[in-house]
Interface confidence: medium
């Protein structure tokens, strides 16, 4: 029950996280700036990964997409790539994790297969979250670096004259959305990996054996429960009786009216 809850919660947290990563990638408010630091001519500029918008104090807003790739900074291209990779990995992870959910039964899929799928999706979520966090952090670093570069240029540019109009860089809402979303995806991925440990069938577990009356005599073979120790040749819990003895897993492998898909 705890495993199912952990897996389900990990899935939901990752789902919210990936939705947030997609939202952050599409948002225009990655950086916000006052272009002309003047109360009368307040021109508010907010920029995203794909386009830039300018809103004036009068309310007039104009947006323009970045149509050229050549003129864009390499850092911006890197951020775009990281966010897209994060979304793609997250989307694949979600798809895999849906089939890995313990509450969903697909045919006669074994727990070991579900455990592997849960681990795969968990790793994908972790990498996806890291990509988003890295992308947002690179962009934030770019803003901070350029802020200090601009401040330095105030005293060195234009023949030593002080640049009185200084662009002020601030972190846009998308950065915070990206950080939170990346963190949630990361947490969701960790939860999926934890759930995987609970799903994986351990070799040292006792297997319940059901005995069925058989027409011929059943010869007892010594070392029949070697699987319980994890040592010896019978670590795969194979049948060790010639007769109608079957492990409980084998008995349950046939679909019944109580199986829900």
């Amino acid at each position: 029950m705890a495993v199912t809850a952990c897996q389900g919660l990990g899935f939901v947290v990752s789902l919210i996280g990936i939705a947030g990563i997609i939202a952050a990638t599409c948002m225009d408010q990655w950086s916000t700036q006052d272009l002309y630091n003047n109360p009368v001519t307040a021109v508010f500029n907010y920029q995203g990964l794909w386009r830039s918008c300018v809103r004036e104090s009068s309310g007039f807003t104009e947006c323009r997409g970045y149509f050229t790739l050549l003129g864009l900074p390499a850092m911006l291209q890197a951020v775009r790539a990281l966010m897209i990779v994060g979304i793609v990995l997250g989307a694949i992870g979600l798809l895999v994790s849906i089939f890995a959910l313990k509450c969903i039964r697909i045919g006669s899929m074994e727990d070991s297969a579900k455990a592997n799928m849960t681990l795969t999706s968990g790793i994908m979520f972790i990498v996806s979250g890291l990509c988003a966090i890295a992308g947002v952090s690179v962009f934030a670093n770019m803003l901070v670096t350029n802020f200090w570069m601009s401040t330095a240029n105030m005293y060195t540019g234009m023949g030593g004259m002080v640049q009185t109009v200084q662009t002020r860089y601030t972190f846009g809402a998308a950065l915070f959305v990206g950080w939170v979303a990346g963190g949630l995806t990361l947490i969701g991925g960790v939860m999926m990996c934890i759930a995987c440990r609970g799903l994986a069938p351990e070799e040292t577990n006792y297997k319940a054996v059901s005995y069925h009356a058989s027409g011929h005599s059943v010869a007892y073979k010594p070392g029949g429960f070697k699987a319980s120790t994890g040592f010896g040749s019978n670590t795969k819990n194979k049948k060790i009786y010639d007769g109608g003895a079957r492990t409980e897993d084998e008995v349950q492998s046939y679909p019944s009216k109580h199986d829900y898909v």
Epitope: W30, N45, Q47, E56, E62, G71, M75, N146, T167
Partner: nanobody, 119 residues
């Protein structure tokens, strides 16, 4: 990087006219906002006029309203400032300013062109 080159400055009599031009060159020319600033000796730099990309939004400082006209030609990557009815108070070094729309881009400035108005 964007380079801005101003031209058109010079000596003019009060009441006369001058036309300043600013040409943008470089890989990223799609600047949203371009403007003209001026700085007289011993004074702070002030914004004279600015224009947005499409030319649909223009701002003028109160001191130049009705006398100066800002325009831009995106095809030629140029911006102009037509200055009419010049006054001695308009004498200053005029700087072209451009702001690229790409995130993290710098403010670009020209070297300036001197405008002198004689009484």
């Amino acid at each position: 990087e964007v380079q801005l080159v101003e031209s058109g400055g010079g000596l003019v009599q009060a009441g006369g006219s001058l036309r300043l031009s600013c040409e943008a060159s470089g890989p990223a020319r799609n600047n949203y906002y371009m403007g003209w600033f001026r700085q007289a000796p011993g004074k702070e730099r002030e914004l004279v006029a600015r224009i947005n990309l499409s030319g649909s939004s223009i701002y003028y400082a109160d001191s130049v309203k009705g006398r100066f006209t800002i325009s831009r030609d995106n095809a030629k990557n140029t911006m102009s400032l037509q200055m009419n009815s010049l006054k001695p108070g308009d004498a200053a070094r005029y700087y072209c300013h451009a702001r690229d729309i790409v995130p993290g881009a710098q403010d670009y400035w020209g070297q300036g062109t001197q405008v002198t108005v004689s009484a």
